[in-house]
């Protein structure tokens, strides 16, 4: 696993404990919480962040609209099971027994129920959408410069393919930013989007993973970008299961 | 290296118009924008306004709307920042900066600017 | 408009001593936080930004933490060229400084 070798420490993901104790005193790294090994030379799974997170101290419109099955993570933080490749299981239970299935970005999809509840598959987000709101700037961005930028950021930044970067919609002041990526898609060593977006929102609320760095300031072709609020819409290759109850 | 590198002090009458510059030098000048933030005698900093010398974009503190205007001379890579009306509460030390290149704070600051407005 | 409240406004150390700066907000601004160093007639140093991350060149005893509203500089152990005049600044929101905490020698 590929980590800082001079000072042992793991470029993607500062939630880790390094050591020197791999396979021919190689810096090998271990996410907190779980104590899984780490692959440092890209992102680490949003299930084993999450982990680590608990575990630390603390029309004719360009714009699009969510359909009627996306989900926006409503239930905030909790300490997920993550299964041995550190993806999400598709049932998560809290200490009072109270059970829920998520898809693969952790985001519950299904109503609260108790240990006899079953979650046959883990469901894939092929799907996010991210919503941005800037703040006012000098003049509008111009689009195609605004585009180039942030599909710069999430090919370099965060490793993503290119390909997966379906679209960015602006409409000023409003930012989307569409992913797309399908199971058949998705081949070994591709970042995942769900994990993309979950950088990129802990960057945008100053939050950054990555080792030795602040919070993420965008700027296009000079320009600051200050971003006033992010919304992240999740949708799923199989619609949501909620009782009517929840939907009115 | 990068350097900013302001004009000199000035001593301006009531009422008149002063215009201050900052020579740019070390890096490409249309990358970042220039910030003017001036600094009363012992007051805290004020932030001006900005403006992206890649298409002469401007924003404004809404405190210096109508007072103060920026401007910018690629050719040059030169910023410029005048105000008008000068009143003895405008007697300050007026700095260029710029951004950090990872972050929005000012890492790169010019000497500063006295101008003192006296009759 | 962000305001931004610093304290102390001044204090008196001696050199050796650990010096806290604090920064509140008037609103969560993300870590979206820069210190800055000033010494008479002299434009002011970046020391930190992002809240806690370093500039190069500057020294480690210097450290920046909090998150949300609230926001601490700390100086581990004053030295002589540390006595000035300390800014925060934040930039989630245009861009506001505090009043400033100016550090003498006791």
């Known amino acids: 696993h590929t980590a800082a070798q001079d000072n042992c420490t793991c470029p993607t993901n500062k939630m880790t404990v390094c050591s020197p104790d791999g396979p021919g005193g190689r810096c090998q790294c271990r996410a907190l919480g779980s104590g899984m090994a780490v692959d440092c030379s890209t992102l680490t799974s949003k299930c084993l962040l999450l982990k680590a997170r608990m575990s630390a101290p603390k029309n004719a419109r360009t714009l699009v609209r969510p359909s009627e099955h996306a989900l926006v993570d409503n239930d905030g933080l909790y300490d997920p099971d993550c299964d041995p490749e550190g993806r999400f299981k598709a049932r998560q239970c809290n200490q009072t027994s109270v059970c829920w299935c998520v898809n693969s970005v952790g985001v519950r999809r299904t109503d609260k129920g108790d240990l006899s509840l079953r979650c046959d598959e883990l469901v894939r987000t092929h799907h996010i959408l991210i919503d941005l709101r800037h703040r006012p700037t000098a003049g509008a961005f111009n689009h195609s410069d605004l585009d180039a930028e942030l599909r710069r950021l999430f090919r370099e930044r965060y490793r993503l393919h290119p390909k997966f970067v379906a679209a960015v919609h602006y409409e000023q002041p409003t930012i989307q930013i569409e992913l797309r990526q399908n199971t058949s898609q998705k081949a070994a060593g591709d970042v995942d989007i769900g994990d993309a977006a979950y950088y990129f929102e802990r960057d945008i609320k100053g939050e950054s993973l990555f080792q030795g760095r602040g919070g993420l300031d965008l700027r296009v072709r000079g320009e600051p970008l200050q971003v006033e609020r992010t919304l992240i819409y999740y949708l799923d290759e199989i619609p949501p299961k909620f009782s009517m109850k929840r939907l009115t | 290296q990068v350097q900013l590198v302001q004009s000199g002090a000035e001593v301006k009458k009531p009422g008149a118009s002063v215009k201050v510059s900052c020579k740019a030098s070390g890096y490409t000048f249309t990358t970042y924008v220039i910030h003017w933030v001036r600094q009363a005698p012992g007051q805290r900093l004020e932030w001006m306004g900005y403006i992206n010398p890649n298409n002469d974009g401007t924003k404004y503190n809404e405190k210096f709307k109508g007072k103060a205007t920026l401007t910018s001379d690629k050719s040059s890579t030169t910023a410029y920042m005048e105000v008008r009306g000068l009143t003895s509460e405008d007697s300050a030390v007026y700095y260029c900066a710029r951004p950090h290149f990872e972050t929005h704070a000012m890492d790169y600051w010019g000497q500063g600017t006295l101008v003192t407005v006296s009759s | 408009d962000i305001q931004m409240t610093q304290s102390p406004s001044s204090l008196s150390a001696s050199v050796g001593d650990r010096v806290t700066i604090t920064c509140k907000a008037s609103e969560d601004i993300f870590n979206r936080l820069a210190w800055y160093q000033q010494k008479p007639g002299k434009a002011p140093k970046l020391l930190i930004s992002g809240a806690t991350s370093l500039e190069t060149g500057v020294p480690s005893r210097f450290s920046g933490s909090g998150s949300g509203k609230d926001y601490t500089l700390t100086i581990s152990s004053l030295q002589p060229e540390d006595f000035a005049t300390y800014y925060c600044?934040?930039?989630?929101?245009?861009?506001?400084f505090g009043q400033g905490t100016k550090v003498e020698i006791k």
């Open positions: 600044q934040q930039y989630w929101n245009t861009w506001t």
